[in-house]
Interface confidence: medium
C-alpha cells in the first residue's frame, strides 16, 4: 500500500533570464527512493541514481543544474520553459510517486511564488 | 582519445577468484562514473556494476550481489573488479565503460575473457 | 527492472536497403534509450542517444525515434559495415539492462 505524499512548490513564475528551483519532497514513508526522474512533459531532464548520483540530459545540460538535494535549479529562463515539470520517486516496495509543478516565465519582473500543495 | 584497456582475466576454477582492472586515458577519469558490463559467449550484453565518479556510490546487478565488488583508484586512472565466489555463468567476457553522468556509457574497452571452468 | 524486448532478433538485408529495428520497454522511459552496433569480437560502439541524438562521428544514416515505451532505429541505406549486432539498452534506472540484441546479416 503506498502511504507517502509529495509535497511540491506548487505553481511557480520565474522572470525570463532568471533562475528557479523546483523542489519535492517525499514524505509519510519508510519506501526506499531509488531514483528520482525529473521530466518537463514528457522529456526527462535528469534522474538522480540512489547508487550513481546525478546525470543530466546532454540536450539541457547548459542550463540544468543538479540540486539543492533532490530538486532541480533551471537557469537562463525563456518563455518555453513555461509549462509542466514532474518529480517521479522510484521507491522500494511503494513503487512510483509522481509530483507536478507548473512553472510561468514571465517577461515582467512581477514574478511572485505560488502556495505550497500537496500531492497524494 | 579516449581509451579504456581491460586487463586480469583469464581461466579459473568455480569458487574461485580474479581481479579485472581497467586503465582509462585520454580523459579526465575522475570525472566520470564507470561501469562493467560482461557479455557471455554467443551472447548478449548484461550489466555487471557502476560506481560513481568520486568512488563513493556502487550498484551491482543482482547475479553478482556480495561476490563481485568494484572500485576505483583515481590517481591512477584505474577501475576494478574484483571477483570472488565465481561460478561457471559468470565466464563471459567483461567491458568496462565510461559513463559521462551516473548511467549514461558513452566509450567502451575491448574486453577481457573470464572463463570459469574446472 | 526494466525489460528490454528488441525485434527482429535476426534480419537479412541487402546494401541500399531501408532497416527498421524495434525495441519496447517493459514501463515508460521517457527518452533515456541509447542504441549500440556490435561487431563480431569488437566493444559495442554508441551510435543514439537519449532516443534520438546521433553520436559524434556516426553517419547520418543512422536515425533513432520513440519515447515512452516503443523506440525504432533506423538505417536509411544499409552499408556494408553495417552488417552487425544492434542492441538497445535502457538508462532510465539501475540496474541498467539491455535489449537482446538484433543481428543484421547479409542477404
Known amino acids: 500500500m503506498m502511504t507517502g505524499t509529495i509535497e511540491t512548490t506548487g505553481n511557480i513564475s520565474a522572470e525570463k533570464g532568471g533562475s528557479i528551483i523546483l523542489q519535492c519532497h517525499l514524505s509519510s514513508t519508510t519506501a526506499q527512493v531509488t531514483q528520482v526522474n525529473w521530466e518537463q512533459q514528457d522529456q526527462l531532464l535528469a534522474i538522480c541514481n540512489a547508487d550513481l548520483g546525478w546525470h543530466i540530459s546532454p540536450s539541457f545540460k547548459d542550463r540544468v543544474a543538479p540540486g539543492p538535494g533532490l530538486g532541480l535549479t533551471l537557469q537562463s529562463l525563456t518563455v518555453n520553459d513555461t509549462g509542466e515539470y514532474f518529480c517521479i520517486y522510484h521507491t522500494y516496495p511503494d513503487g512510483t510517486y509522481t509530483g507536478r509543478i507548473f512553472l510561468e516565465v514571465l517577461e515582467s519582473s512581477v514574478a511572485e511564488h505560488g502556495a505550497r500543495f500537496q500531492i497524494p | 582519445e579516449v581509451q579504456l584497456l581491460e586487463s586480469g582475466g583469464g581461466l579459473v576454477q568455480p569458487g574461485g577468484s580474479l581481479r579485472l582492472s581497467c586503465a582509462a586515458s585520454g580523459f579526465t577519469f575522475s570525472s566520470y562514473a564507470m561501469h562493467w558490463v560482461r557479455q557471455a559467449p554467443g551472447k548478449g550484453l548484461e550489466w555487471v556494476s557502476g560506481i560513481s565518479s568520486n568512488g563513493g556510490s556502487t550498484s551491482y546487478a543482482d547475479s553478482v550481489k556480495g561476490r563481485f565488488t568494484i572500485s576505483r583508484d583515481n590517481s591512477k586512472n584505474t577501475l576494478y573488479l574484483q571477483m570472488n565466489s565465481l561460478r561457471a555463468e559468470d565466464t563471459a567476457v567483461y567491458y568496462c565503460?565510461?559513463?559521462?553522468?551516473?548511467?549514461?556509457?558513452?566509450?567502451w574497452g575491448q574486453g577481457t575473457l573470464v572463463t570459469v571452468s574446472s | 527492472d526494466i525489460q528490454m524486448t528488441q525485434s527482429p532478433s535476426s534480419l537479412s538485408a541487402s546494401v541500399g536497403d531501408r532497416v527498421t529495428i524495434t525495441c519496447r520497454a517493459s514501463?515508460?522511459?521517457?527518452?533515456?534509450l541509447n542504441w549500440y552496433q556490435q561487431k563480431p569480437g569488437k566493444a559495442p560502439k554508441l551510435l543514439i542517444y537519449a532516443a534520438s541524438s546521433l553520436q559524434s562521428g556516426v553517419p547520418s544514416r543512422f536515425s533513432g525515434s520513440g519515447s515512452g515505451t516503443d523506440f525504432t532505429l533506423t538505417i536509411s541505406s544499409l552499408q556494408p559495415e553495417d552488417f552487425a549486432t544492434y542492441y538497445c539498452q535502457q538508462s532510465y534506472s539501475t540496474p541498467l539492462t539491455f535489449g537482446g540484441g538484433t543481428k543484421v546479416e547479409i542477404k
Open positions: 514501463q515508460s522511459i521517457s527518452s533515456y
Open positions: 565503460a565510461r559513463a559521462p553522468y551516473s548511467v549514461w556509457i558513452d566509450y
